[in-house]
């Protein structure tokens, strides 16, 4: 499956963009997010490439200090209650417990911004992606992957964090965007939506896929998150959308046929070992590029997104399993974990392969419109 | 086809016990939560207590919480729920029920017949 | 909890109508609904789930509709074996709860 690039491909033809949206980002949702007073509640502190691993995933990822960009993981947020949007607004609600844990959701008050300055930034993510904006970058070279073939033993973490199910990484998981840009993985977690609800972060086109990965690593100029939080490329994650198909995925199948001893907040297994590739698209070399934020508090920016253009197939089935079986805190069910999508204020994403050239018939004149920037450096 | 059949309620005095037994077949029991739902003469439905595909989360409705326990064993394809310290509001005709997912907290697809307990000096 | 009112809780209507039964939640549900049909001394039968689906083996004539917190069940046209209490059901939210009941009487 490829994203869509044509309009016939894209189920909501051109949509609203972030790019034209000219409401700050975290005050207010973009018109094609505004939650709807119909929509059920989503109830998600959202998750996570901004949950990062705690000092018991990676020993070297220690805080130094409370300042902002300084961060452990206990103040990162975690989720306390249902919102209303089907599309959850950029707003959260803060509470002090006895850990200090900072407590929010998503269509609840105060604004994130209060919750983490970081939040009211002019680069947020997620984006909604327009192919035919995109600026092709042909030094943008394949994806490079290596030790992410694990064997069952030692076995990893499975966890219900409230926001999300997440799955920490063991050392030694590297990936290159390219040459001098190294990269160690840290955990995966997954964003989704609920029954007959899509709930990826990112859309194409405004269309939103039913579900999202994240593979969130750290630069190997940094030795702790802390130190590489809202250092532009400090972070990358690599995200991938989730789609139905006809057959069961079984790479999938060896995390989601866990997720009931999961199934509360808080809780957690201990699961084989997989090959975490092969959770990701196989083709490594298309993907749009672009840099954003983490898409929670503390919302930190400058890390490097790279989105796939292919997407994953799962069954209907699966894809029920992971919006049904997990709850989040009180008695609400864990759905609808993403964040709406946030205006581009003039980033452009670039793209491996030409992703504005459309084969189809009604389109002969290729649209690109941006240049490439960077050209992948 | 899909059977599910109840066993072992009865007449019993408040503060008695009582354990009933709900014996599957036609499908792959392992792969399915299961619940317990009871009716009080004459009354509607109330969810009492699930188990999930598994056995590995219990939930309880608050009016029973404490007092029963939900269990499965998957290599006998049977479900349980040991009821404690019975009121005579327990009385009621309790089925068991598949829901239509490993999770418990689902729609039941299948309902057995039903077993009736009794609670009363 | 979320409470599930259901309305009418009875009705009387003759073989060959429609009748519409409606259930309302105290908050959003989705379309995490089911209705069943019970008959006296008999267990519940599940007709529809996710507020749309039909149960396999449940004759078309029967069909539901909503989403959020407004849900009905519609029997196009009904027949003689129809006549039978119905009940809704959330399972949204914990603890999964039922509606109180229609029963529909013939006319």
């Known amino acids: 499956q490829r994203l869509p690039r044509m309009q016939e491909d894209s189920p909501l033809g051109g949509g609203s963009s972030g790019e034209d949206d000219p409401l700050g980002e975290e005050d207010l949702p973009s018109e094609e997010d505004s939650p709807r007073e119909e929509d059920p509640p989503g109830e998600e502190d959202l998750p996570g490439e901004e949950d990062l691993p705690g000092e018991e995933d990676l020993p070297e990822v220690k805080p130094k200090s409370e300042e902002e960009g300084s961060l452990k993981l206990e103040d990162l947020p975690t989720v306390e209650a249902p919102g209303d949007p089907q599309e959850p607004q950029n707003n959260a609600h803060r509470d002090k417990e006895g850990d200090d844990q900072s407590h929010w959701r998503y269509g609840g008050d105060p604004p994130w911004p209060r919750v983490s300055p970081a939040c009211a930034g002019r680069f947020q993510s997620p984006v909604d992606i327009r192919p035919q904006l995109a600026a092709f970058c042909p030094a943008l070279r394949p994806l490079e992957l290596l030790g992410f073939q694990l064997p069952p033993l030692p076995e990893l973490r499975l966890r219900n964090n409230g926001h999300s199910v997440q799955l920490t990484l063991p050392p030694g998981l590297e990936m290159a965007l390219g040459p001098g840009r190294e990269y160690r993985a840290l955990q995966l977690h997954l964003h989704w939506g609920a029954a007959g609800r899509p709930g990826s972060e990112h859309t194409v086109e405004g269309h939103r896929f039913p579900a999202e990965i994240h593979v969130v690593h750290l630069s190997t100029a940094f030795a702790r998150v802390d130190e590489a939080l809202g250092r532009p490329g400090g972070l990358a994650v690599l995200a991938a959308f989730l789609e139905e198909g006809p057959e069961e995925n079984s790479a999938y199948e060896q995390l989601l046929s866990r997720l009931e001893e999961i199934a509360e907040e808080g809780s957690e297994t201990q699961v084989p070992g997989l090959d975490i590739s092969a959770l990701l698209p196989s083709d490594f070399s298309r993907y749009f590029q672009y840099e954003g934020s983490l898409t929670t508090p503390p919302c930190a920016q400058g890390v490097i997104w790279t989105v796939f253009n292919q997407t994953v197939m799962l069954s209907a089935k699966q894809l029920h399993t992971l919006s049904d079986t997990l709850w989040g805190p009180g008695d609400s069910r864990l759905q609808l974990n993403f964040r709406a999508t946030q205006p581009l204020n003039g980033r452009v994403i670039e793209a491996s392969f030409p992703a504005g050239v459309d084969s189809s018939p009604r389109a002969a004149e290729p649209v690109q419109l941006n240049s490439c920037l960077a050209a992948g450096d | 086809q899909v059977e599910l059949v109840e066993s072992g309620g009865g007449l019993v005095q408040p503060g008695g016990s009582l354990r009933l037994s709900c014996a599957a077949s036609g499908f792959t029991f392992s792969s399915y939560g299961m619940s317990w739902v009871r009716q009080a003469p004459g009354k509607g439905l109330e969810w009492v207590s699930g188990i999930s595909s598994l056995g590995s989360t219990t939930y309880y409705a608050d009016s029973v919480k404490g007092r029963f326990t939900i269990s499965r064993d998957n290599s006998k394809n049977t479900l349980y729920l040991q009821m404690n310290s019975l009121r005579a509001e327990d009385t009621a005709v309790y089925y068991c029920?598949?829901?239509?997912?490993?999770?418990?907290?689902?729609?039941?697809?299948?309902w057995g017949q039903g077993t009736l307990v009794t609670v009363s000096s | 909890d979320i409470q599930m009112t259901q309305s009418p809780s009875s009705l009387s209507a003759s073989v060959g109508d429609r009748v519409t039964i409606t259930c309302r939640a105290s908050q959003d549900i989705n379309n995490y609904l089911s209705w069943y049909q019970q008959k006296p001394g008999k267990a519940p039968k599940l007709l529809i789930y996710g507020a749309s689906n039909l149960q396999s083996g449940v004759p078309s004539r029967f069909s539901g509709s909503g989403s959020g917190t407004d849900f009905t069940l519609t029997i196009s046209s009904l027949q003689p074996e129809d006549f039978a209490v119905y009940y809704c059901q959330q399972y949204y939210g914990r603890p999964t709860t039922f509606g109180q009941g229609t029963k529909v009487e013939i006319k």
């Open positions: 029920a598949r829901t239509g997912s490993p999770g418990t907290f689902m729609h039941g697809d299948h």
